[in-house]
C-alpha cells in the first residue's frame, strides 16, 4: 500500500544552470492522495529560508504528479542561490531538498558556457 | 527485479579512449543519481562522479575532469562513462551505482566491469 | 576534500564476537538540511559492493538487524552485534554530503 504522505520530488544536490535574461521555470514535483496541500517557495539566506512573496506561480497537473512552479520572467542575476519548496499537510509542514540556480549573465560571458563549465566555475557566479 | 549491469570493459592501450555502459532495469532511472566508482586491484574505492538522468547534470572527482564524460538517456534507462586518454594506473573494475535521489531510500550497484590499460 | 579515515585496518574476530568498525571525518559531514550523509558498505570478494546503512543509521532493505549504525558529526561507528560467517568482508564508509565524495581506506573483519 503506497504511502499517503506527502512527498516533494526535488533531488538533493540538484541544479540548473540558467541565463540571466532567459525565462525559466522552477518545478517543485508534488505527490499527494486526496487534497492538494498548499505549496510556497523560499529562497535560502544563509541557514533561513526566506518565503517568497508576491512571485508568479502556478500549477501544473500531470497523471502522477502536481507541479507548483515558480517562474521567472526574465532571470535575473539576483535569482543565482538556493530554493527550497514546502507544502503544509495535516499541520505539518514538509521541505523539500533545496535546488540551486546557477545564473550567468551574459553580458559578462562572451559566449554561453557549458552547464558543467557553469557549475565547475563559480567566478562566472553571482552569489 | 532490479538490475545494473556494466559492459564495455576489457584491454585497451595506453592513451586510447573507452566507452563503458551501464543498463539498468526494475526503477525509474530519471528519479536516481547514477555514480560511477572504480577499484583499483587489491585497492580501496574511489568516486568518479555522477548523473543526474533527468537533465543531464554531472560531477566529477576533479583528477577525472576533463578526462571523464559521464551521460544517461533516460528513455533506453542506459548510462555511460567515457574515458579518454587512458593509463596504467586506469586499470580498475568500474562500478556504477543508482542512487534514489529525493529520500535516499535505495542505493544499487551493479557487478563491475575490468578495464585493464596495458601495451 | 573530506578525507575519512577507518580503523582498525584489520578486525580479527570469532563468529558470535560483537564488532565495532570506526570512522572519523575530517570535518563535520551535517549537511544543511539537518542530515549527515555518512553510508556504510559491504564488500566481500570477487563481489560488488552493497549499500548497509545509510544516513548514519538507517539499515538498507533485507540487511539483517544485527547491524546498526550510530554516531554524528565526523565520529562514526558500525557496529555488527554477533557475528555470522557471511559477516567476514571489507567494510567501507562513505560520505555523500560534500562534493568530491570520498570513501575510508576500509576495515578488513578477518575469521580470528
Known amino acids: 500500500k503506497e504511502s499517503c504522505d506527502v512527498q516533494l520530488y526535488i533531488k538533493r544536490q540538484s541544479y540548473h544552470s540558467i541565463f540571466a535574461g532567459d525565462p525559466f521555470k522552477l518545478e517543485c514535483p508534488v505527490k499527494y492522495c486526496a487534497h492538494r496541500p498548499q505549496v510556497t517557495w523560499c529562497k535560502l539566506n544563509g541557514t533561513t529560508c526566506v518565503k517568497l512573496e508576491g512571485r508568479h506561480t502556478s500549477w501544473k497537473q500531470e497523471k502522477n504528479l502536481s507541479f507548483f512552479i515558480l517562474h521567472f520572467e526574465p532571470v535575473l542575476p539576483s535569482d543565482n542561490g538556493s530554493y527550497r519548496c514546502s507544502a503544509n499537510f495535516l499541520s505539518a509542514i514538509i521541505e523539500s531538498h533545496s535546488t540551486t540556480l546557477y545564473v550567468t549573465d551574459v553580458k559578462s560571458a562572451s559566449e554561453r558556457p557549458s552547464k558543467d563549465e557553469m557549475a565547475s566555475r563559480p567566478w562566472l557566479l553571482y552569489s | 527485479e532490479v538490475q545494473l549491469v556494466e559492459s564495455g570493459g576489457g584491454l585497451v592501450q595506453p592513451g586510447r579512449s573507452l566507452r563503458l555502459s551501464c543498463t539498468t532495469s526494475?526503477?525509474?532511472?530519471?528519479?536516481?543519481?547514477i555514480h560511477w566508482f572504480r577499484q583499483a586491484p587489491g585497492k580501496g574505492l574511489e568516486w568518479v562522479g555522477r548523473?543526474?538522468?533527468?537533465?543531464?547534470?554531472?560531477k566529477y572527482t576533479a583528477s577525472f575532469k576533463g578526462r571523464a564524460t559521464i551521460s544517461a538517456d533516460g528513455s533506453k534507462s542506459i548510462a555511460y562513462l567515457q574515458m579518454n586518454s587512458l593509463k596504467t594506473e586506469d586499470t580498475a573494475v568500474y562500478y556504477c551505482?543508482?542512487?534514489?535521489?529525493?529520500?535516499?531510500?535505495?542505493?544499487?550497484w551493479g557487478q563491475g566491469t575490468l578495464v585493464t590499460v596495458s601495451s | 576534500e573530506i578525507v575519512l579515515t577507518q580503523s582498525p585496518g584489520t578486525l580479527s574476530l570469532s563468529p558470535g564476537e560483537r564488532a565495532t568498525l570506526s570512522c572519523r571525518s575530517s570535518?563535520?559531514?551535517?549537511?544543511?538540511?539537518?542530515?549527515?550523509?555518512l553510508n556504510w558498505l559491504q564488500q566481500k570478494p570477487g563481489q560488488a559492493p552493497r549499500r548497509l546503512i545509510y544516513?548514519?543509521?538507517k539499515l538498507d532493505s533485507g540487511i539483517p538487524d544485527r547491524f546498526s549504525g550510530s554516531g554524528s558529526g565526523t565520529d562514526f561507528t558500525l557496529t555488527i552485534s554477533r557475528l555470522e560467517p557471511e559477516d567476514f568482508a571489507v567494510y567501507y564508509c562513505?560520505?555523500?554530503?560534500?562534493?568530491?565524495?570520498?570513501f575510508g581506506q576500509g576495515t578488513k573483519l578477518e575469521i580470528k
Open positions: 551505482a543508482s542512487y534514489e535521489g529525493y529520500y535516499e531510500r535505495f542505493g544499487y
Open positions: 544516513l548514519v543509521s
Open positions: 548523473n543526474d538522468p533527468a537533465n543531464g547534470n554531472t
Open positions: 562513505w560520505q555523500d554530503t560534500h562534493f568530491p565524495y570520498t
Open positions: 526494475g526503477f525509474n532511472i530519471k528519479d536516481t543519481y
Open positions: 570535518q563535520s559531514l551535517l549537511d544543511r538540511d539537518g542530515k549527515t550523509y
